[in-house]
């Protein structure tokens, strides 16, 4: 799993007039990390784990970055020509990643009224536009605006790419939180399915980092993929993750089945409760 930093900014317009505020959230490694507090006009950490990432450092830099990005996005929305009356939104999602091989990725995506209309691979400058005619029109509109001051745009996006990666590296280097290993708590439950069958569910929770193997085994051999159901690996709000795997088995054969878990080089097996 690569380390990632994801910025999600939204600006609004009403009857063609761009509103003054903006909404902003930042995710670090898929976890809610920062949000922009519009009352206090400051970036605020999302929970204790986010505060722990930066320790006693202030959030001034993050506040400055989000404020600048919000201003840029409002200017972009002001140049979208097809705004009709009522409420409209322009959303920008920016993601940068550092992979295990140290290669990096950086991308940017624009959504109008919730619909993706323009993406850019920031490193290569490649733009992609969905096929729909509305997306094509919006994309042309926004790209023309961004091209109006080509040098500024070029500098802005390359700086954005560098800044995102620089921030991500800063968080990774300064934070013990992001280098920690938290083993999962594993819990196996059973429930009646249909006559003669039971559903067994294995849940792993409160683990970090995100990478985990969770699978059902019969007589020590992993079951095939299509006989198991997996849940997504999701953040649990505390800077850790949770997931689950379930399968259906014959009643009376419980002792043949175990849940196998592997995480950060450690592994364990968990029986079905009788």
């Amino acid at each position: 799993e690569p380390h990632s930093l994801r910025y999600n900014l939204t600006v609004l317009s009403w009857d063609g007039s761009v509103q003054s505020g903006f909404l902003a959230e930042v995710h670090l490694d898929g976890q809610p990390f920062l949000r922009y507090d519009r009352q206090k006009c400051r970036a605020k950490p999302q929970g204790q784990w986010a505060e722990d990432v930066l320790g006693n450092k202030t959030w001034d830099r993050e506040t400055r970055d989000l404020t600048g990005n919000g201003k840029d996005l409002r200017m972009t929305l002001a140049h979208i020509k097809d705004q009709k009356e009522g409420l409209h939104s322009l959303q920008e999602i920016r993601v940068c990643e550092i992979h295990e091989d140290n290669s990096t990725r950086s991308s940017q995506h624009f959504y109008y009224d919730g619909e993706l209309f323009l993406s850019q691979n920031v490193e290569t400058e490649e733009w992609t536009v969905p096929q729909s005619s509305r997306a094509q029109t919006l994309a042309m509109n926004v790209r023309n605006f961004l091209k109006e001051d080509a040098m500024k745009t070029k500098t802005h996006y390359h700086a954005m790419h560098a800044d995102c990666l620089q921030e991500l590296r800063r968080y990774l280097e300064s934070s013990v939180v992001l280098r920690r290993r938290v083993p999962p708590m594993v819990n196996v439950t059973r429930s009646e399915a249909s006559e003669g069958n039971i559903t067994v569910t294995c849940r792993a929770s409160s683990f970090y980092p995100r990478n985990i193997t969770l699978t059902w085994r019969q007589d020590g051999v992993s079951l095939s993929h299509d006989t198991q159901q997996w849940g997504d690996v999701l953040p649990d709000g505390n800077g850790t993750y949770q997931t689950w795997v379930a399968t259906r088995i014959c009643q009376g054969e419980e002792q043949r089945f175990t849940c196998y878990m592997e995480h950060s080089g450690n592994h364990s097996t968990h029986p079905v409760p009788s």
Partner: antibody
Framework: QVQLQESGPGLVKPSETLSLTCTVS?????????WNWIRQPPGKGLEWMGF???????KYNPSLKSRVTISRDTSKNQFSLKLSSVTAADTAVYYC????????WGQGTTVTVSS | EIVLTQSPATLSLSPGERATLSCSAT???????FHWYQQKPGQAPRLLIY???NLASGIPARFSGSGSGTSYTLTISSLEPEDFAVYYC?????????FGQGTKLEIK
């Protein structure tokens, strides 16, 4: 109809600088896309050398270190490749190509490095 | 850099048969930045499939592409005599852009 055409000397001496130009017709190089140089040594595979983008940004293959320079002349709708300190290993067919998924290519020009 | 490894290096098949060419990457690639090319002797490569699964202009429907992450596949459903050539995969996710070493599709 988009067309790309490479031009330049077919023979370069070792330690000298290889210079090639790609003339583009049917599309403005400042409108969009990356404008790439790609080479293919005899009997071998393809190697991406670098590009100049529509905005003027240049990106290079680190394997060519600091030997490669790509520039553009927007008034002539051309972009150029310079490869310094060439050796026999730089003997190849040199292609210019448009895009990121390279949708238009020149026909290629053979450059031999020999004294 | 992302290294692309194509397999097999050479594939010997007869016209009418189905061809499956693979390309494996050392790091995950976004499917919108993955492409396939065909090259015949003495010619420039030509774009065959762009963004993993989209046929380039003028490419017949017997060609198809699929894949995600680190594993991609080019399939030719029923080989025609003109399909025997060298095929290259390419990624445009990160700089440097890289190609696979090529798969030579030859007549059996």
């Amino acid at each position: 109809q988009v067309q790309l055409q490479e031009s330049g000397p077919g023979l370069v001496k070792p330690s000298e600088t290889l210079s090639l130009t790609c003339t583009v017709s049917g599309y403005s190089i400042t409108s969009d896309y990356a404008w790439n140089w790609i080479r293919q040594p005899p009997g071998k595979g393809l190697e991406w050398m670098g590009f100049v983008s529509y905005s003027g940004t240049t990106k290079y293959n680190p394997s060519l270190k600091s030997r490669v320079t790509i520039s553009r002349d927007t008034s002539k709708n051309q972009f150029s490749l310079k490869l310094s300190s060439v050796t026999a290993a730089d003997t190849a067919v040199y292609y210019c190509a448009r895009g990121y998924g390279f949708d238009y290519w020149g026909q290629g020009t053979t450059v031999t490095v020999s004294s | 850099e992302i290294v692309l490894t194509q397999s097999p290096a050479t594939l010997s098949l007869s016209p009418g048969e189905r061809a499956t060419l693979s390309c494996s990457a050392t790091s995950s690639i976004s499917s919108i930045y993955f492409h396939w090319y065909q090259q015949k002797p003495g010619q420039a490569p030509r774009l065959l499939i762009y963004r993993t699964s989209n046929l380039a202009s003028g490419i017949p429907a017997r060609f198809s592409g699929s894949g995600s992450g680190t594993s991609y596949t080019l399939t030719i459903s029923s080989l025609e005599p003109e399909d025997f050539a060298v095929y290259y995969c390419q990624q445009g996710t990160t700089i440097p852009f890289t190609f696979g070493q090529g798969t030579k599709l030859e007549i059996k």
